[in-house]
Amino acid sequence: KLLQVSTIAMQQQEKLIQQERALLNFTEWKRSCALQMKYCQAFMQNSLSSAHNSSPCPNNWIQNRESCYYVSEIWSIWHTSQENCLKEGSTLLQIESKEEMDFITGSLRKIKGSYDYWVGLSQDGHSGRWLWQDGSSPSPGLLPAERSQSANQVCGYVKSNSLLSSNCSTWKYFICEKYALRSSV
């Protein structure tokens, strides 16, 4: 009889341990859910608030028509400038028209004055042709004014109101470009 009672007691204790474990798992699951819910809500709020104040360009970017431009505050070589722009979901500036060139040079005059800024233009090592970073050719009026005497790779930059060329490994500011967000209003 005593053995029977002790077996029942052990079974009850085992049941209790299992229930405690289940409760602990449930509490942990609930805590995890609450935490995920908090992150979800924060993410939703961020998304909603950014959708509310959705300007066509991010903070510190300049808008002109369908494009947003970022003028860097750091120097880097041309290849690193490419990467820096990609990090922002953009590419180095690709000047498509004289109007765009005028806007850029006018903006630079207001912001920083006469410095050098890398754009997405470089010379093909074999043919010597100038190409934009996406492989397209610049229009004839948008070719660098002077040919660099460098034996290394040659890249394009903007200074004052001119497009010039230099060794890609020199340090300059750079300009990134991305498309402006269309207003849904």
């Epitope: 992150y39 993410f43 961020n46 990609l86 990090k87 922002e88 979901g89 953009s90 590419t91 970073q133 996406d134 492989g135 470009e177 991305k178 498309y179």
Partner: nanobody, 122 residues
Framework: QVQLQESGGGLVQPGGSLRLSCAAY????????MGWYRQAPGKERELVAG???????TYGNSVRGRFTISGDNAKNTVYLQMKSLKPEDTAVYYC????????????????EGQGTQVTVSS
């Protein structure tokens, strides 16, 4: 946790073609751009190509005209079509994703895959 999974590397003869793929799995990371770096033995790592979620494209000077990058935003996947391959294209190709962490530790970040070997040899 987000992971990048590359595929498509291998051995190819000079003049041949290969197509690399890279898919980003996971969450808490909003991707701005994806692309490819490469590193050959004893050489510096170089950017091969990149594509933004807006479809803007940039190529490294040595591959322009031969390589084509494309992406699928819905699948968080980037492809690199490599044509007219040369022995100097031999390298480990690493997929990269640039973006913003959207979880508790927000901020910008870069993710990189394990790399896939591309060997161009006859």
């Amino acid at each position: 946790q987000v992971q990048l999974q590359e595929s498509g590397g291998g051995l190819v003869q000079p003049g041949g073609s290969l197509r690399l793929s890279c898919a980003a799995y996971g969450s808490i990371f909003s991707i701005n751009a994806m692309g490819w770096y490469r590193q050959a033995p004893g050489k510096e790592r170089e950017l091969v190509a990149g594509i933004t979620t807006q479809g803007r494209i940039t190529y490294g000077n040595s591959v322009r005209g031969r390589f084509t990058i494309s992406g699928d935003n819905a699948k968080n996947t980037v492809y690199l079509q490599m044509k007219s391959l040369k022995p100097e294209d031999t390298a480990v190709y690493y997929c990269s994703a640039w973006g913003v962490k959207t979880g508790p530790e927000s901020g910008s970040g870069t993710l990189e895959g394990q790399g896939t070997q591309v060997t161009v040899s006859s």
